[in-house]
Amino acid sequence: KVILDKYYFLCGQPLHFIPRKQLCDGELDCPLGEDEEHCVKSFPEGPAVAVRLSKDRSTLQVLDSATGNWFSACFDNFTEALAETACRQMGYSSKPTFRAVEIGPDQDLDVVEITENSQELRMRNSSGPCLSGSLVSLHCLACGKSLKTPRVVGVEEASVDSWPWQVSIQYDKQHVCGGSILDPHWVLTAAHCFRKHTDVFNWKVRAGSDKLGSFPSLAVAKIIIIEFNPMYPKDNDIALMKLQFPLTFSGTVRPICLPFFDEELTPATPLWIIGWGFTKQNGGKMSDILLQASVQVIDSTRCNADDAYQGEVTEKMMCAGIPEGGVDTCQGDSGGPLMYQSDQWHVVGIVSWGYGCGGPSTPGVYTKVSAYLNWIYNVWKAEL
């Protein structure tokens, strides 16, 4: 049975086996095509999601589709039902929390009262000015809180208490990539992790431990990537894994927050990386224990210099490392989070690519998560 499962796939109607390597090869080998059903699927970028959250106290903004202008949501007459609609528009299914926050003197966008129309937030046509002088601060999910704060040093062993969103993504029980829990159903990782094996069936997620082998595996229902863009082959290195059953959150299993749409991190901003990847370039062995390191944002201009990546780092990527080199993500860390701490922890990047590991002029290159928020929300909405 184990040998059969490992090497063969059972087609139905009529029942017969096909070699597992014929799964997800683009050919219909089973009469009903089920060998091509549970495969990595691509999902387009999709339309603009008409709500978003700002780094200014997680305040809600709404798009006026007629003009293309964004407005801040006034707290006047804002209700729990409107909060739920806003979060559903971003694909969240959990119960949101919201509160009033005072409009600041540097408030940039105009402010409007919000209403709902066919499950979407709209600007209330008949509304007056914002009487409360307050905005809506909205949290769709409790995220980004860990039991333990890491110490700022070079590279050290990590505890799952510090990083309860970190998961190991495994194929045939072998660690391939890292990933981050975003909500009970979804894990964020890198698309390139699935280049070799595009069948969903053999992929598993392990959560809740800092040791590689010691935690139960979770079945995966779907793996979703963005359509490939041949113009920018290294772009779009992002994937979402939908779990078969929702996670139960605990002290060691918790979600990390997505970044705000306007989360612009300046050079030298401190960030953190974690993973079970190689501890030496071409070192040939994964770390059994989760490792953590503090790094910083490296200016894209510096990263694209002639002695570095020569223009390969696009707007949808970011660089992080330390100026003198020596601290970096490596093979096996791919898909894991690049993290920023404000009030909560946010996954601002996904370990993507780089030349070597830890070189001074070639730091790690990360998928910029804020560039893909729209895609994430559209995937989640489609799967609600």
Epitope: C74, I103, G104, P105, D106, Q107, L109, D110, V111, V112, N125, S126, S127, G128, P129, C130, L131, G133
Partner: antibody
């Protein structure tokens, strides 16, 4: 684009009243507060009061309380400022101005061209 | 009411000069301060809000700083069209009040 067009210059006798109009266009009239500010010849700016065009509620500076009335007509997107018991020191340019954003305390991002009111016997 | 005191009341400068105008509030107004420019016979024009945020369409040679009670408007390199009167205004508490103005003249 946002436009505030005010009525023409007025000459009034002391003790009379004047009513200045301000017609708004280029945005949803009821969604934004309207302020009135005046400027005596060669002097600085002086805030007079504010009106919420949605409900018509008003708030006036202490100095003008009892003499000023601000009203609006939503059908024509026009606000009015009436000042009574005029005296010579009320000679000034009167401006209507809209806030940058729909919040009472925010600065004035859009201004009318001004209406000169001269009080002279 | 909060009193706003501007200094100097007037200044003479040449094209290309760096010009600084200060505004002091009689009590703390956090960052609730705006700066306006007014040319003769025209309505005021908003330059800066929130003490340091540049209003859309305003040239970047204008900048604002400060919080609490002391604020500054700086014109980094004075241009011919910048000769005008400048007013500060507090929006922290009712009623809004303006400074007395600073007239920037050609030297």
């Amino acid at each position: 684009q946002v436009q505030l067009v005010q009525s023409g210059a007025e000459v009034k006798k002391p003790g009379a009243s004047v009513k200045v109009s301000c017609k708004a266009s280029g945005y949803r009239f009821t969604s934004q507060y309207m302020h009135w500010v005046r400027q005596a010849p060669g002097q600085g700016l002086e805030w007079m009061g504010i009106i919420n065009p949605s409900g018509g509620s008003t708030s006036y500076a202490q100095k003008f309380q009892g003499r000023v009335t601000m009203t609006r007509d939503t059908s024509t997107s026009t606000v009015y400022m009436e000042l009574s018991s005029l005296r010579s020191e009320d000679t000034a340019v009167y401006y209507c101005a809209r806030g940058r954003i729909a919040v009472a305390g925010h600065p004035l991002g859009y201004w009318g061209q001004g209406t000169l009111v001269t009080v002279s016997s | 009411d909060i009193q706003m005191t501007q200094s100097p009341s007037s200044l003479s400068a040449s094209v290309g000069d760096r010009v600084t105008i200060t505004c002091r509030a009689s009590q703390s107004i956090s960052s609730w301060l705006a700066w306006y420019q007014q040319k003769p016979g025209k309505a005021p024009k908003l330059l800066i809000y929130g003490a340091s945020s540049l209003q859309s369409g305003v040239p970047s040679r204008f900048s604002g700083s400060g919080s609490g009670t002391d604020f500054t408007l700086t014109i980094s390199s004075l241009q011919p069209e910048d000769f005008a009167t400048y007013y500060c205004q507090q929006a922290n508490s009712f009623p809004p009040t303006f400074g007395g103005g600073t007239k920037v003249e050609i030297k």
